[in-house]
Interface confidence: low
């Protein structure tokens, strides 16, 4: 029988009751139109909805939109457009959340075409109060706030200058133009790109990466015949046109632009992008495209400075047309990531890697599935999940997978068992011990989300029907109750709960149709008195992450040690609560090749550990590029996995020498880098 | 061994209705899609209907909707396709498939249902 | 909905020939794509899955090939029982379906 329908299940005492006592309607006075909501601040119970309504007239669109206003996580709303002098606010730009705890939200409004510049509502105390503020500039992008600064503000205009505010938009200086992109670094530091010759598309591959880092009085340009750059971790990367034809490369900089090194990946044609899929203060992971419009490319891992990289994974699914890919950061278990595959016969595969991108392997196959008409063999197969590109081809997959560093090993997706993602409907899948294992949790597409740490799961199934009710889950995902929660069904447009997955609060949003009207309407369902008590010690118990093989004394270990956690059992239904903290105990594990990536110049052979010189460089001098110098590497063809903490064991030596020999790989050598001051 | 066994075929006046039925064996049921396929006679194949694993999804071609219904009994093994205001062109063989994903992939004999007064 | 078109729609071979049937789409169904075998009086038979994989119990001497629109299912080297219709189906996004409208094989 489906999981949630056998007679094991223990049912969740008086829940109809305890869940109807719990449930908040809210009715919004709009047609229906669009809807934006925003969470402000964390554990504040503040929710920002802006619903706007644009009614086509002859000759132009009239637009409406009103601003409501909660402080009990979406139970009750206040009609708050007064308070933005009832404004029409522009949706494209959505709320400007500032960062942290700060209470601070900016909203852009629409203006008249004639209009000298643009306006904002800013609030600083949680949307209790706006300022109405008019720029002198029309904006073109979203106000943008400094990570440590949230006083500090950029914005680009519409003709292209760089504007910087420092007291929370009260006050504009433009302190650059012919701004192509800009970005917030650390310290309160400012990347951007300038083009000279006319706009940011005749210049691409003949830009200036630029960096301040006080806020406009002084400048410094730190490298030249830009394409583009990004920032990733401690990492500032950026992909320079080379001398002599069209190509271009990464080059990598840790120090914030002063000094930069190649990294050792292929260079790409005008056709063809670099994307860093995830980075940390470790390492790296970059997608490198295939010549031709293959749809696929190669994924690279970077060692501790971002140079030296390792073939990760080849023909990975990312998609030039539309720019997909389903690369995701499993974030509730350390080291996981998934991804997607084009094999050669154009079928498209999940693979999965539980060490940072060392080795990927397929998902098992849920034990209670069977595979589908895609597998070769029916008795061997694989989990295949839905991700960003599936969604992408308007398959019938509401949601991408989900996980969160709270719900240790807790990871949701849909997906299809075979030998490759199958077109038909998809099913939801969990995984409670992130990702090497999976069940079968809920039969077709749904809606979901992870509330209370995981002491709860809900979901709403993806129907064209109305629906009215809700399905929950207190033991991750094995037994379901469902809950109606109102009598005249809606049509569902989305689920809404707190970042962070602490809280008990739901919000189904979705809108009423009657003959005349349509109405946006929310039913917030607070699960608390669902789990009565606090969880206490015994309720949980001690979980190794990782573990595959409790016979051997290294079980667990993965980039260099183990980690011990305190999880919920599944029985136990009680509350983890606001405040829960995960418990882990790590311990170190030994040195095995397994915590050595392949050094510059070699690789690993399949389902080999050891690292082999490459043929093609056997007896040649490894000469390379670092911070504008030559160096010279002898090695035996190992280096430490970034992040890697293992001690003892095997310990591969290397040693880099300076060849005091300049290579700019026609960067800007540091010596040679202009500054100015305004 | 996987088996599909049709039944319900038969004779019907034009308007009439009919219940198909499609008895499942030698393999898991309800972990598996299903599907009636239809082939009037010399004539190539036409789908019919699609029901997921657990019956929560139904799938039909438009010129079929709101005439045919598919549904399955898991306790059962069983498939069922309900006809209504049948008409001389709805006259073929009907076979229930085992629908995993990309592929039908096993079939019934097939069961003739014939419309004609 | 995706248009099949299936050629030829008939075809007269020798044993030992070389057969190949094709399938065109009017869009693009990324492999999505079942070859089936029926002989007269008898029930659909699965003979290729996914474009190019060959099912469970299908001689070797058939094998699928194709992506994007254009799909061909070839017989290396014919044998008597392979004289049937032949039918292609897509499986890509939403219903319908849509089956090709068959090939006859036929004997020289």
């Known amino acids: 029988s489906a999981p949630g329908e056998d007679e094991e299940c223990g049912r969740v005492r008086d829940f109809v009751a305890k869940l109807a006592n719990n449930t908040h309607q809210h009715v919004f006075d709009d047609l229906r139109g669009s809807v934006s909501l925003s969470w402000v601040g964390d554990s504040t119970g503040v929710i920002l909805v802006l619903t706007t309504f644009h009614v086509p007239l002859v000759i132009m669109t009239f637009g409406q939109s009103k601003l409501y206003r909660s402080e009990d996580y979406g139970k009750n709303f206040k009609d708050i457009t007064d308070l933005i002098n009832n404004t029409f606010i522009r949706t494209e730009f959505g709320m400007a959340i500032g960062p942290e705890n700060s209470g601070k939200v900016v909203l852009t409004a629409e203006v008249s075409g004639g209009s000298r510049g643009g306006r904002i509502f800013r609030s600083s105390d949680f949307a209790k109060n706006f300022v109405q503020t008019d720029l002198p500039f029309h904006p073109l992008t979203q106000m943008m706030y400094s990570p440590q600064n949230s006083d500090y503000l950029l914005a680009l205009s519409t003709e292209n200058g760089l504007w910087v505010s420092k007291n929370f938009g009260g006050k504009w200086e433009e302190i650059h133009k012919a701004v192509c992109l800009a970005k917030w670094g650390s310290d309160n530091t400012i990347f951007f790109t300038t083009y000279a010759n006319g706009s940011c598309k005749a210049d691409l591959g003949a830009l200036e990466l630029w960096r301040t880092s006080d806020l406009g009085k002084s400048f410094k340009t730190i490298g030249v015949k830009i394409y583009s750059f990004g920032l990733g971790g401690r990492f500032l990367f950026a992909s320079v046109m080379a001398d002599k034809d069209t190509t271009r490369r990464i080059h990598v900089s840790t120090d914030q632009g002063d000094t930069w090194s190649m990294a050792q990946l292929p260079s790409v044609g005008q056709e063809q992008f670099y994307s860093i899929l995830a980075a940390n203060d470790d390492m790296v992971f970059m997608h490198v495209d295939e010549p031709g419009d293959t749809g696929f490319g190669t994924i690279f891992t970077s060692d501790d400075r971002g140079i030296v990289y390792s073939k990760s994974l080849d023909r990975h699914l990312y998609t030039t047309t539309g720019g997909e890919t389903d690369f995701t950061n499993v974030t509730s278990l350390r080291g996981v990531y998934i991804t997607s595959v084009l094999s050669e016969d154009n079928s498209i595969q999940t693979m999965i890697t539980f060490d940072q991108g060392g080795r990927w392997t397929h998902l098992r196959k849920p034990e209670n599935s069977e595979c589908d008409a895609t597998a070769k063999n029916k008795n061997e197969c694989s989990l295949h999940i839905h991700a960003s590109y599936s969604i992408s081809q308007k398959l019938n997959v509401p949601m991408a997978p989900l996980s969160e560093p709270n719900a240790v090993g807790i990871v949701i997706a849909h997906g299809s068992v075979g030998d490759a993602i199958s077109v038909m409907v998809p099913d939801v899948y969990i995984s409670d011990d992130g990702g090497y294992s999976w069940t079968k949790m809920l039969e077709g597409p749904h809606y979901y989300t992870i509330l209370d740490s995981g002491g709860i799961i809900v979901a709403i199934e993806h129907s064209s029907r109305p629906i009215n009710v809700i399905k929950f889950s207190t033991d991750e995902g094995q037994c379901w109750q469902t809950y109606t929660f109102t009598r005249d069904p809606i049509y569902f447009t989305g689920l809404a709960s707190e970042p962070g997955a602490r809280s008990m609060n739901i919000s189904i949003w979705g809108f009423t149709e009657s003959f005349l009207t349509s109405q946006w309407v929310s039913y917030t369902i607070d699960f608390k008195d669902i789990l009565e008590r606090n969880c206490e010690e015994k309720d949980y118990t001690i979980w190794l992450a990782h573990s595959t093989d409790p016979e051997d004394y290294e079980d667990g270990c993965i980039l260099g040690y183990k980690e011990q956690f305190l999880r919920l059992r599944k029985s136990s239904v009680c509350q983890n609560g606001r405040d829960y903290v995960v418990t882990k105990q790590p311990s170190i594990c030994l040195c095995s090749l397994e915590d050595f990536l392949c050094d510059f110049g070699y690789y690993r052979p399949e389902n080999d550990s050891k690292c082999v010189e490459q043929p093609e460089l056997k007896g040649h001098d490894l000469e390379f590029c670092l911070y504008g110098r030559e160096e010279h590497l002898t090695t035996n063809g190992y280096r430490k996995i970034p992040g890697d903490k293992c001690q003892g064991g095997v310990n591969p030596v290397r040693e880099v020498k300076d060849l005091k020999k300049k290579c700019t790989s026609n960067f800007l050598s540091p010596e040679k880098q202009n500054s100015k001051s305004n | 061994e996987v088996q599909l066994v049709e039944s319900g075929g038969g004779l019907v006046q034009p308007g009439g209705s009919l219940r198909l039925s499609c008895a499942a064996s030698g393999f898991t049921f309800n972990i598996y899609g299903m599907s009636w396929v239809r082939q009037a006679p010399g004539k190539g194949l036409e789908w019919v209907a699609t029901?997921?694993?657990?019956?929560?999804?139904?799938y039909y071609p438009d010129i079929l909707k709101g005439r045919f219904t598919i549904s399955r009994d898991n306790a059962k093994n069983s498939l069922y396709g309900q006809m209504n205001s049948l008409r001389a062109e709805d006259t073929a063989v009907y076979y229930c498939?085992?629908?995993?994903?990309?592929?039908?992939?096993?079939w019934g004999q097939g069961t003739l249902v014939t419309v004609s007064s | 909905d995706i248009q099949m078109t299936q050629s030829p729609s008939s075809l007269s071979a020798s044993v030992g020939d070389r057969v190949t049937i094709t399938c065109r789409v009017s869009?693009?169904?990324?492999?999505?794509l079942a070859w089936y075998q029926q002989k007269p009086g008898k029930s659909p038979k699965l003979l290729v899955y996914a474009a190019t994989n060959i099912a469970d119990g299908v001689p070797s001497r058939f094998s699928g090939s194709g992506s994007g629109t254009d799909y061909t299912l070839t017989i290396s080297s014919l044998q008597p029982e392979d004289f049937a219709t032949y039918y292609c189906?897509?499986?890509?996004?939403?219903?319908?379906?849509?089956f090709g409208q068959g090939t006859k094989l036929e004997i020289k």
């Open positions: 869009e693009n169904i990324y492999s999505n």
């Open positions: 189906q897509h499986f890509w996004g939403t219903p319908p379906w849509t």
């Open positions: 029901i997921s694993s657990g019956g929560i999804y139904t």
């Open positions: 498939a085992r629908h995993p994903g990309g592929a039908m992939d096993y």
